[in-house]
Each structure stands twice: as C-alpha cells, then as structure tokens.
C-alpha cells in the first residue's frame, strides 16, 4: 500500500512526587517501521529511560505505537518527541500549561 503518515499525539499524566509521565503516541501510519523517541534539550534519551509499546495494527490497515518517559514536573518545555517515518520527520513538544494533549498529522 501507499505511505500513510502518522498522527502524533503528546499527552501528560500526573504522578506522585513531582514527576509526570509524558507519552507520545503515533497512530494511523503505514508502513509499520517508525522511529519514535524522546529528547531532552535536543539530546536523545537513553533506551533505559524510555518505555515503548509494540507497533500494533489498528484495524484499518494502518499501525499504532507509543513511547513514554518520566520527567520532573515543570521541565516539560525541555522535552520533545521525535518521529521518523518513511523519509519524513517531525518534532513534537510536550503541551504546557493546562493543555494536556497535542496532536499533529504529518504530510
């Protein structure tokens, strides 16, 4: 099939002791090979500080996956989710303030 670019969505969930989990979800993409990783101040986070979901079919002939990491509350602006898919790439910030999600479709 032809390339379908991912929809990328970044969300935050509050956890205890001043830390939050930020999750970057990519959905509705084809083919299944995708790079999704977190950066802090432009530097890639190590694998041992990130958690990935499997790349799974979403039932529409496309795929979905996610990557998450735990960060200090108040440092959201230092983190971005980086995506590469089929020769395209994009960088997605963590939403600030009261906004708890951000999504963007790549073309």
């Amino acid at each position: 099939g032809s390339t379908v670019p991912p929809m990328v969505n970044v969300t935050c969930s509050e956890v205890s002791e001043g830390n939050i989990t930020v999750t970057c979800r990519a959905s509705s993409f084809y083919p299944r090979n995708i790079t999704l990783t977190w950066r802090q101040d432009g530097v890639s986070l190590s694998h041992n500080t990130q958690q990935w979901g499997d790349v799974l079919p979403d039932g529409n002939g496309t795929y979905q996956t996610w990557v998450a990491t735990r960060i200090r509350q108040g440092e959201e602006q230092r983190f971005t989710c980086y995506m590469e898919h089929s020769g395209n790439h994009g960088t997605h910030p963590v939403p600030s303030g009261n906004s708890h999600h951000h999504h963007h479709h790549h073309h």
Partner: antibody, heavy 120, light 107 residues
C-alpha cells in the same frame, strides 16, 4: 541497495583536524540516522556519534568537544569533523546506518571504513 | 558509560563445531544488545539485534540469548565463512558501547 562509503585523507598531522565524508545510496538521509564508529589498530569498536533524519546530533560525551557531525541531504552525504587529532586517534573510521524502531536500535548497514593515520 | 566485557579474546574451533561467545555488561541492559561480525578484511555486518533477533539474510546457525548482564552468541555449526571477530554492543544507555571482540579461528 543500501550502501555507505567513507572517504578520508588517509594521513593527518598531529594537532590538525580530520574531515571524513560518508556518501550513501539506497536510502534517504531525511528518514534515517547515520552513525560514526571507529576502530584503533588491534582494538575494539568505539561509537563517536550520530546524526538523525532531522539533522539533530548525538555525541559520545568523551569526544563531544572535538567532534562535529553534519550532512547535506541533497548530496546524500554525511560529514565527520574532528579537531586536535593525536596519535591515538589513528583508526579505521566507519559510517553506519542506524535503525531505531522502539526497543530495537542497531546499525544495519556499514561502510567499508577509511583508515586514518595521525603522524608527523 | 556501560562497560561491555568479552572475556575470551580468541578461540579455535573445528569446522562443524558449536561455538559460544560470551559478553557481560557492567549493569543490567534489558536485552538492549546487538552482535556484529567483522571479517578479516574489516567488513562489518549486523548479526543479531535485541539479544536474539536475526536480520534477514543471516544464517539460522547463528543465535543469541541472555538477560540482565549476561549474553551470548552461538554458532551451531561452524562454517569457513564464520572466521571473523564478533562484537557485542549495548544500547541501553548512551553512548552505545562495544565489547572488546572475540576472534574465532579454525583449529
């Protein structure tokens, strides 16, 4: 067919800088990372750094102050520049494509390498 | 940095032998381990990624296993073209680091 080919000066004088070019074919630099790895004579492999599809770079912190990685997407070329070379920088320098898929990150295709000797 | 140790610098084996090469990490690496083969002419090839996955084109006589800090590469039936040096590499934590290599020779 994915290929990478390094080209370098061969001989560099101590304290001078090194420039190596990696020319790639069979894939786009906008959608793949390229890594630099070196191997001193008779020793193991050492990761120097990488450049991502968007041009962002990651470096080995032990060498970061001397290293610069850049690229020209239109020419399918990646460039390694290292300053203040010493004799222990003598090595074979490789570029390798990085595949980064979730829990998996590996260097799936390597160039043949180019030998750099630091000597006066 | 995470230190990767291959205690056997070189080993001699007969054609058809089963050969096992060990690699240990200075801390747990969550199966974030790859193996590479370097032929005598310097050519480097990916052999196994994520501890045990074989890329397409790699013969099934190669296999990988391990967990925590201890990992191994096994060649079940040594062939002449397997004469090479083998390197483990972790990517749990940046920078990625390699073992010192194990050279496999024919007895």
């Amino acid at each position: 067919q994915v290929q990478l080919k390094e080209s370098g000066p061969g001989l560099v004088a101590p304290s001078q800088s090194l420039s190596i070019t990696c020319t790639v074919s069979g894939f786009s630099l906008t959608g793949s990372g390229v890594n630099w790895v070196r191997q001193p004579p008779g020793q193991g492999l050492e990761w120097l750094g990488m450049i991502w599809g968007d041009g962002n770079t990651d470096y080995n912190s032990a060498l970061k102050s001397r290293l610069s990685i850049s690229k020209d997407n239109s020419k399918s070329q990646v460039f390694l520049k290292m300053n203040s070379l010493q004799t222990d920088d003598t090595a074979r320098y490789y570029c390798a494509r990085g595949a980064h898929y979730g829990k998996r990150w590996y260097f799936d295709v390597w160039g043949a390498g180019t030998t750099v000797t630091v000597s006066s | 940095d995470i230190q990767m140790t291959q205690t056997t610098f070189s080993l001699s084996a007969s054609l058809g032998d089963r050969v096992t090469i060990s690699c240990s990490a200075s801390q747990g690496i969550n199966n974030y381990l790859n193996w590479y083969q370097q032929r005598p002419d310097g050519t480097v090839k990916l052999l196994i990624y994520y501890t045990s996955t074989l890329p397409s084109g790699v013969p099934s006589r190669f296999s990988g296993s391990g967990s925590g800090t201890d990992y191994s590469l096994t060649i079940s039936n040594l062939e002449p073209e397997d004469i090479a040096s083998y390197y483990c590499q972790q990517y749990s934590k940046l920078p990625p680091t390699f073992g010192g290599g194990t050279k496999v020779e024919i007895k």
